[in-house]
């Protein structure tokens, strides 16, 4: 017996080849022996079977001897014993038609789980295996699940259903609804303007939602709310914003923040959620201010960091066009009696300078003067 | 029977343009990945990229992105490999092969391209 | 990207000799290993998937193993057409990266 395999959906062709190439009698029925579809002359003649409306046959083949059955729009219940009667001779096909579900939702959030369903004919025994759009494959039965979900893991899911070593391949669109980025880190110079931009991974039609974005100052003992927002329709609107620091948002995507000013007492990590309408769960997205201060009081010349910065970070102070006064893995560098010329307090990684902050110490005789 | 059946052989010159074929037959050529091998010559195996002919998305090896294109016409059930400017270190036996999500079942039997000035 | 290293690099031996090649991943990649072998001016041939799972007409002599990170090739015992170079192969996640092969003579 023949097997052919099905998807849920899709059209199907059963093939039925007659000894003599030309057009005679034929009809197909199913196992229940109820007549499908079959000619009568050069007409096609339909049974009276379930499939009656999304049966047809190549008529253009009958003179070859190749009497076809298509079935549209094939139901997992489509899966049955096909018996083609032409001539003396009777031929049997069995098609299994197969459906491949994603759980509820094809738009998941980072860190949930996408389970894939297998809807499947009784008495089949299917095994499915499907690949990610980064290559990754997971292996299952009727139900597929993957803990989890990645951005990486946005796009196209390949899965192959075996049946009979015959096989059948499913193609699943996956949305993963994320930020770009995890976690990102602005440094700035005390009393610049800080710009936080927090771009989506993803693009919907419609976008509705509210969000927040919570700031833990490291010169706190606890966090607060800067800011929440509503989205509408990729709209945004402030709805409660602090009096210090007064924060501005645009109002289109990506959601972007502007904070006036870069001052010690801002210094720290925020937390920006996003709650997705009819999503369960939140995006989120971590976002560090540092600011520096270099200053001189008196005859002490100091450069000092605030916000989360790492171990690994060298400040330093130095002379242009000088190797470095003082350099240490420290947040706060100072030289007693500076001399006279411009310095240059740096926040390095590994030789990169992340800020630089430049103060200008005249001869002992006159004040700074901060450019 | 599964079978890849690859282009003949090519000789050609530093900068110019080059399209081999891999026609697939014995199965459904759409249903299945292709995906395509270098072999330099005396050395090992490098997985290039991978291309699905029903709806033509592509993956490729970071090593080879922007150096080739991957492409498939599934009226002739024909996948391709082509180069827009050869380098003489583009020298090398090229396989296509299908792909079973990710495991190389059955292959071509290898398109010899001589890049020499 | 995954690194697959295969040892040995060659190997001299006889028919009828036990031979057996390793792989090792950089990182753990589950079951999803195949083997291939190829010899002189021919195609690769697949030979294993799935780590230990023996493609249709391959003889019962190829045997592999392993999981997360160490894989082996067995020929329980080696025939004159099995001289060769075997590759092993990740597709656990893009790029699907092949061991460098190990070449095996007749001694």
């Known amino acids: 017996k023949k097997v052919v395999l099905g998807k849920k959906g899709d059209t199907v062709e059963l093939t039925c080849t007659a000894s003599q190439k030309k057009s005679i009698q034929f009809h197909w029925k199913n196992s229940n022996q109820t007549k499908i579809l079959g000619n009568q002359g050069s007409f096609l003649t339909k049974g009276p079977s379930k499939l009656n409306d999304r049966v047809d046959s190549r008529r253009s083949l009958w003179d070859q001897g190749n009497f076809t059955l298509i079935i549209k729009n094939l139901k997992i219940e489509d899966s049955d014993t096909y018996i083609c009667e032409v001539g003396d001779q009777k031929e049997e096909v069995q098609l299994l038609v197969f459906g491949l579900t994603a759980n509820s939702d094809t738009h998941l959030l980072q860190g949930q789980s996408l389970t894939l369903t297998l809807e499947s004919p009784p008495g089949s025994s299917p095994s499915v295996q499907c690949r990610s759009p980064r290559g990754k494959n997971i292996q299952g039965g009727k139900t597929l699940s993957v803990s989890q979900l990645e951005l990486q893991d946005s796009g196209t899911w390949t899965c192959t259903v075996l049946q009979n070593q015959k096989k059948v391949e499913f193609k699943i669109d996956i949305v993963v609804l994320a930020f770009q980025k995890a976690s990102s880190i602005v440094y700035k110079k005390e009393g610049e303007q800080v710009e936080f931009s927090f771009p989506l991974a993803f693009t919907v039609e419609k976008l509705t939602g509210s969000g927040e974005l919570w700031w833990q100052a490291e010169r706190a003992s606890s966090s607060k709310s800067w800011i929440t927002f509503d989205l509408k329709n990729k709209e945004v609107s402030v709805k409660r914003v602090t009096q210090d620091p007064k924060l501005q948002m645009g109002k289109k995507l990506p959601l972007h923040l502007t904070l006036p000013q870069a001052l010690p007492q801002y210094a720290g990590s925020g937390n920006l959620t996003l709650a997705l309408e009819a999503k369960t769960g939140k995006l989120h997205q971590e976002v560090n201010l540092v600011v520096m201060r270099a200053t001189q009081l008196q005859k002490n010349l100091t450069c000092e960091v605030w916000g989360p910065t790492s171990p690994k970070l060298m400040l330093s102070l130095k002379l242009e066009n000088k190797e470095a006064k003082v350099s240490k893995r420290e947040k706060a560098v100072w030289v007693l009696n500076p001399e006279a010329g411009m310095w240059q307090c740096l926040l390095s990684d590994s030789g990169q300078v992340l800020l630089e902050s430049n103060i200008k110490v005249l001869p002992t005789w006159s004040t700074p003067v901060q450019p | 029977e599964v079978q890849l059946v690859q282009s003949g052989a090519e000789v050609k010159k530093p900068g110019e343009s080059l399209k081999i074929s891999c026609k697939g037959s014995g199965y459904s050529f759409t249903g299945y990945w292709i995906g395509w091998v270098r072999q330099m010559p005396g050395k090992g195996l490098e997985w290039m990229g991978i291309?699905?002919?029903?709806?033509?998305?592509?993956t490729y090896s970071p090593s080879f992105q922007g150096q080739v294109t991957i492409s498939a016409d599934k009226s002739i059930s024909t996948a391709y490999l082509q180069w827009s400017s050869l380098k003489a270190s583009d020298t090398a036996m090229y396989y296509c092969?299908?792909?079973?999500?990710?495991?190389?079942?059955?292959w071509g039997q290898g398109t010899l391209v001589t890049v020499s000035s | 990207d995954i690194q697959m290293t295969q040892s040995p690099s060659s190997l001299s031996a006889s028919v009828g000799d036990r031979v057996t090649i390793t792989c090792r991943a950089s990182q753990g990649i589950s079951s999803w290993l195949a083997w291939y072998q190829q010899k002189p001016e021919k195609a690769p041939k697949s030979l294993i998937y799935s780590a230990s799972s023996l493609q249709s007409g391959v003889p019962s002599r190829f045997s592999g193993s392993g999981s997360g990170t160490d894989f082996t090739l067995t020929i329980s015992s080696l025939q004159p057409e099995d001289f060769a170079t075997y590759y092993c192969q990740q597709y656990d996640s893009y790029p699907y990266t092949f061991g460098q092969g190990t070449k095996l003579e007749i001694k």
């Open positions: 291309i699905y002919p029903g709806d033509s998305d592509t």
């Open positions: 092969a299908r792909d079973q999500l990710g495991l190389f079942d059955y």
